[in-house]
């Protein structure tokens, strides 16, 4: 099982969670495996049980503390190991020295709400969740709007190159149902990636006023 292609990828949410995915071709589905975290300058260790997410991949979340507590800094290195039970002992399958602030993936933005809606425009706001104060304003956002008859993949991406937790959508069609999503990414970190997309926010533009040329 060890000789198949193996990948062990983890991301830090910038506060108190490291999420890991381990994939291993030819690994036994019913094998009991876990991720163990051993920081280089902290007194705590943490373990999570890997649970199957597909035929050959497993995932788990290392919960390091209260959701908004700052458990790691830019100087921390956490040795992460995948351990799988083989008979009476645990065997190390994968290992890495994890630099949390080089491998960031924030939580999806939350609390999306329509601030103001008109016939052709809609102002939407949101909040970021469990994001470190270390970033200050060094965040960027991507947003997309789902129009009738289209898919999310077809929706053009709107980029906000600063920490701006609102957007004014223009050139919308009156009396039309839309959905909106946003995601966030810190500017810091060589392997940092976008957060998951937020839950979609559904809204409807106002109908055009009768007798008015819109």
């Amino acid at each position: 099982a060890v000789n198949g292609t193996s990948q062990f990828t983890c991301f830090y949410n910038s506060r108190a969670n490291i999420s890991c995915v381990w994939s291993q071709d030819g690994a036994l589905q019913d094998t009991s495996c876990q991720v163990h975290a051993w920081p280089d300058r902290r007194r705590w260790n943490q373990t999570c049980e890997l649970l199957p997410v597909s035929q050959a991949s497993w995932a788990c979340n290392l919960i390091l503390g209260a959701p908004d507590s700052q458990k790691l800094t830019t100087v921390d290195i956490v040795t992460l190991r995948v351990l799988c039970r083989e008979g009476v002992r645990w065997r190390v399958m994968a290992i890495q020295d994890f630099k949390p602030f080089e491998n960031l993936r924030l939580m999806a933005p939350i609390s999306l709400q329509v601030v103001h809606v008109e016939t052709h425009r809609c102002n939407i706001s949101w909040e970021i969740s469990q994001a470190s104060h270390y970033f200050e304003r060094h965040l960027e956002f991507e947003a997309r709007t789902l129009s009738p008859g289209h898919t999310w993949e077809e929706a053009p991406l709107l980029t906000l190159k600063q920490k701006q937790e609102w957007i004014c959508l223009e050139t919308l069609t009156p009396d039309t149902q839309y959905e909106f999503q946003v995601r966030v990414k810190p500017l810091q970190g060589e392997f940092t990636t976008w957060s998951p997309w937020s839950q979609p926010l559904a809204f409807r533009t106002k109908p055009a006023a009768l007798g008015k040329d819109t």
Partner: nanobody
Amino acid sequence: QVQLVESGGGLVQAGGSLRLSCAASGSIFSINAMGWFRQAPGKEREFVAAISRSGGSTAYVDSVKGRFTISRDNSKNMVHLQMNSLKSEDEAVYYCAATAAVGWTSRWITTDFDSWGQGTQVTVSS
């Protein structure tokens, strides 16, 4: 299964040098990293040095940095530990170890390794 055989141990004066070698055989295709550990009487086995499959990454315990050098000869399935400026505290049984674990760390521990040699004694006289 991987078989490991150490050689090169012996008696050396303090300040002297010694070169340990480890020959690997068997399922060597599964080896990702190899390392050296040592165990003095009454003490726990401790990490000394490790090297990646390609030889591009190495790690050492602080107490041997600048004195010991680990190297790898993949064509001969050998790993070497060149030990210079030996001290009395370097006296121990030295074990070669191999792991199939994918990836790399600078903080190896004994349980990371699944194949072990029988060990070779290094004695440092003053």
